[in-house]
């Protein structure tokens, strides 16, 4: 079971990997997500990444974790948050209320150096990742893969 | 419940290595990144590195990068931590650690094995 | 690597004090700090994790706030066993580094 209220809220420009700006553009009253090379003095968009502290048993979860995760949401601009499109396998921004839907909740994972990784809390062992210089929802379907440079992302408070 | 449970005490000459080891019960092994953090005696806590059960990938820090290895067999819930040319400063007490949230360091460590004594003495 | 700056290094106190434990990061960590408890041969004890948040069972007389570089470890009224050393960790980022430690020991 999720929080309700966030334990902290960081905010955040996010970068690939291979240090590529995730962006956020207004286009005919929504917004598309963009992966790109900023220009040297280019400003970052920021995210408000807000986390939560989710405790279960395994057995309830079905994942097979047994104790504390964390749980993040991600607001580029007031009132918009990335959702996964499990249908798609895309990554939105949907504008909505709280309570959040579960879409808009990702596993944090951060074992991986500095590089944190996002799970859908909605299809296990799907990840954001890059593909086609968009994000996109990603299946890893073994551990070693967990690893792949397109589901690593920077954050940073620059 | 949630047990870490670390090889016995080593005496070790200086320049060989030592390989402790730490086998973990109780929970799920590879959701959980697992940390080697040193105490040498009368002294403070010193962060060592991190392996990642899941795919076996590892972060240390840079005073040990190229004397540590860190290891994992995911068959029997077992990390290792081998250092090698050790040094009578590396006298300590090491510990195995477990972080209390799976996938992620952020929320500290909870689970600690009770330590494994390295004396390296000539 | 962030250096974590813990003070004081010991303090002496009675039973019933209130004892406050401070620690400052060398760059902003966010709420990424974690409070630990060791006893002389045992391992440490998480006591506070998030910077506020009470570890489960943990008594409540044990609090934490702040963020970004400054950072308080608050015993509200000290017990006979919270006599032990406090550290201090940045979980923020690798290398994960610890405070010091402050001891804190019977006046």
């Known amino acids: 079971i999720t929080g309700i209220s966030p334990i902290t809220e960081y905010l955040a420009s996010l970068s690939t990997y291979n240090d590529q700006s995730i962006t956020f553009a207004l286009e005919d009253e929504s917004y598309e997500i963009y992966v790109e090379d900023l220009k040297k003095d280019e400003k970052k968009d920021k995210v408000l990444l807000s986390y939560y502290e989710s405790q279960h048993p395994s057995n309830e979860s079905g994942d097979g974790v047994d104790g504390k995760m964390l749980m993040v949401t991600l607001s580029p601009t007031k009132d918009f948050w990335l959702h996964a499109n499990n249908k798609e396998h895309s990554v939105e921004l949907h504008k909505c209320e709280k309570p959040l839907p579960d879409q808009a909740f990702f596993v944090l994972h951060n074992m991986h150096s500095n590089c944190v990784s996002f799970e859908c809390k909605t299809d296990p062992g799907v990840f954001i990742g890059v593909k086609d210089n968009h994000l996109a929802l990603i299946k890893v379907d073994s551990s070693e893969n967990l690893c792949t440079e397109n589901i690593l992302f920077k954050l940073s408070e620059t | 419940q949630v047990q870490l449970v670390q090889s016995g005490a080593e005496v070790k000459k200086p320049g060989a290595s030592v390989k402790v080891s730490c086998k973990a019960s109780?929970?799920?092994?590879?959701?959980?990144?697992m940390h080697w953090v040193r105490q040498a005696p009368g002294q403070g806590l010193e962060w060592m590195g991190e392996i990642n059960p899941h795919g076996g990938s590892t972060s240390y820090a840079q005073k040990f990068q190229g004397r540590v290895t860190m290891t994992r067999d995911t068959s029997t819930s077992t990390v290792y931590m081998e250092l090698s040319s050790l040094r009578s400063e590396d006298t300590a007490v090491y510990y195995c650690a477990r972080p209390s949230a799976a996938y992620s360091h952020y929320l500290g460590i909870d689970m600690w094995g009770r330590g494994t004594l390295v004396t390296v003495s000539s | 690597d962030i250096q974590m700056t813990q003070s004081p290094s010991s303090v002496s106190a009675s039973v019933g004090d209130r004892v406050t434990i401070t620690c400052r990061a060398s760059q902003g960590i966010s709420s990424w700090l974690a409070w630990y408890q060791q006893k002389p041969g045992k391992a440490p004890k998480l006591l506070i994790y998030?910077?506020?948040r009470l570890q489960s069972g943990v008594p409540s007389r044990f609090s934490g706030s702040g963020s970004g570089t400054d950072f308080t470890l608050t015993i509200s009224s000290l017990q006979p066993e919270d006599f032990a050393t406090y550290y201090c960790q940045q979980a923020n980022v690798f290398p994960l580094t610890f405070g010091g430690g402050t001891k804190v020991e019977i006046k």
């Open positions: 998030a910077a506020s």
């Open positions: 109780g929970y799920t092994f590879i959701s959980y990144g």
